[in-house]
């Protein structure tokens, strides 16, 4: 960053897709700012125009491609720089020599379904989104449940160490409501950091056979 | 490789209004900043108007402040201009232009172009 009031964050998601946050304390609102995108060895520059998020922040993504299209590599490096308009001039706010598979956040794991549900039981499955194939199996997932009467961050979290895209939830209270979220994270990259929460997949047990313990 | 399609141009009186579109296949459009420029008889390719991917900010030649706008609908992959108040100096063959680099769009050297749609202006 260009001064100390100044964090300028970016996550690539492992395809076509680098999302930056800026930050900076003053900042003019109406300023026109843009995020430009300079790699080191790619014929192309990308720009994307930052978007306020919050007071002093802005936020904007770097399309690079089709969705699915491997756009860079580990070797690559990508200078990022904010630049804001001043006058007639626009000048660099912040700049970070972007190395893409050490700050890597995928999209949030998608297709969450139930596979077979019981009374204690339920098996769910998903599927990662827009994950680069050099990865091969080296992901985790990390999973919570929402029961009754608690909040997200009261449900313990469930640590799946491999590419393993499904889980069999047990333990469950029969004929209840309940919601399902997974995330997921390469384990290459020093800044890498989860993903956001998929979208929360309910589902309900099923009742308790009449007459009989459970 | 991107493609870029015009339509809109013609035939009107100064003082008039024409709008028109710039449809973008091939690629993802929200990539791109658009521009339109324009080529009269004779003179070389000017800049007139450009959006960022957003949307959000307009940039224009002198010549056509407060007559000109230029949009975008990112669902329609689709850049407009609209042109009010046309004037005989607006009569040139009038060019849609993308770039991934917001700060290259200005420049002939680097972009997409479409084939031009012709506007003349007749007094």
């Known amino acids: 960053a260009v001064n100390g009031t100044s964090q300028f964050t970016c996550f690539y998601n492992s395809r076509a897709n680098i999302s930056c946050v800026w930050s900076q304390d003053g900042a003019l609102q109406d300023t026109s700012c843009q995020v430009h995108a300079w790699p080191d060895r790619r014929r192309w520059n990308q720009t994307c125009e930052l978007l306020p998020v919050s007071q002093a922040s802005w936020a904007c993504n770097l399309i690079l491609g089709a969705p699915d299209s491997q756009k860079l590599t580990t070797v690559d490096i990508v200078t990022l720089r904010v630049l804001c308009r001043e006058g007639v001039r626009w000048r660099v706010m912040a700049i970070q020599d972007f190395k893409p598979f050490e700050n890597l956040r995928l999209m949030a794991p998608i297709s969450l379904q139930v596979v077979h549900v019981e009374t204690h039981r339920c098996n769910i499955s998903w599927e990662i989104s827009q994950a680069s194939h050099y990865f091969e199996r080296h992901l985790e997932f990390e999973a919570r449940t929402l029961s009754p009467g608690h909040t997200w961050e009261e449900a313990p979290l469930l640590t799946l160490k491999q590419k393993q895209e499904w889980i069999c939830l047990e333990t469950l209270t029969p004929d209840t409501q309940y919601e399902f979220q997974v995330r997921v994270k390469p384990l290459q990259g020093e800044f890498t950091t989860w993903s956001p929460w998929s979208q929360p997949l309910a589902f309900r047990t099923k009742p308790a056979a009449l007459g009989k313990d459970t | 490789e991107v493609q870029l399609v015009e339509s809109g141009g013609g035939l009107v009186q100064a003082g008039g209004s024409l709008r028109l579109s710039c449809v973008v296949s091939g690629d993802v459009f929200v990539r791109y900043t658009m521009a339109w420029f324009r080529q009269a008889p004779g003179k070389e390719r000017e800049f007139v108007a450009a959006?960022?991917?957003?949307?959000?900010?307009?940039e224009y030649v002198d010549s056509v402040k407060g007559r000109f706008t230029v949009s975008r609908d990112n669902a329609k992959n689709t850049v407009y201009l609209q042109m009010n108040n046309l004037e005989p100096e607006d009569t040139a063959v009038y060019y849609c232009?993308?770039?991934?680099?917001?700060?290259?769009?200005?420049?002939?050297?680097?972009?997409?172009w479409g084939q031009g749609t012709q506007v003349t202006v007749s007094s």
């Open positions: 959006v960022t991917d957003s949307g959000r900010t307009t």
């Open positions: 232009a993308a770039n991934t680099d917001y700060f290259q769009i200005r420049s002939v050297d680097n972009n997409a």
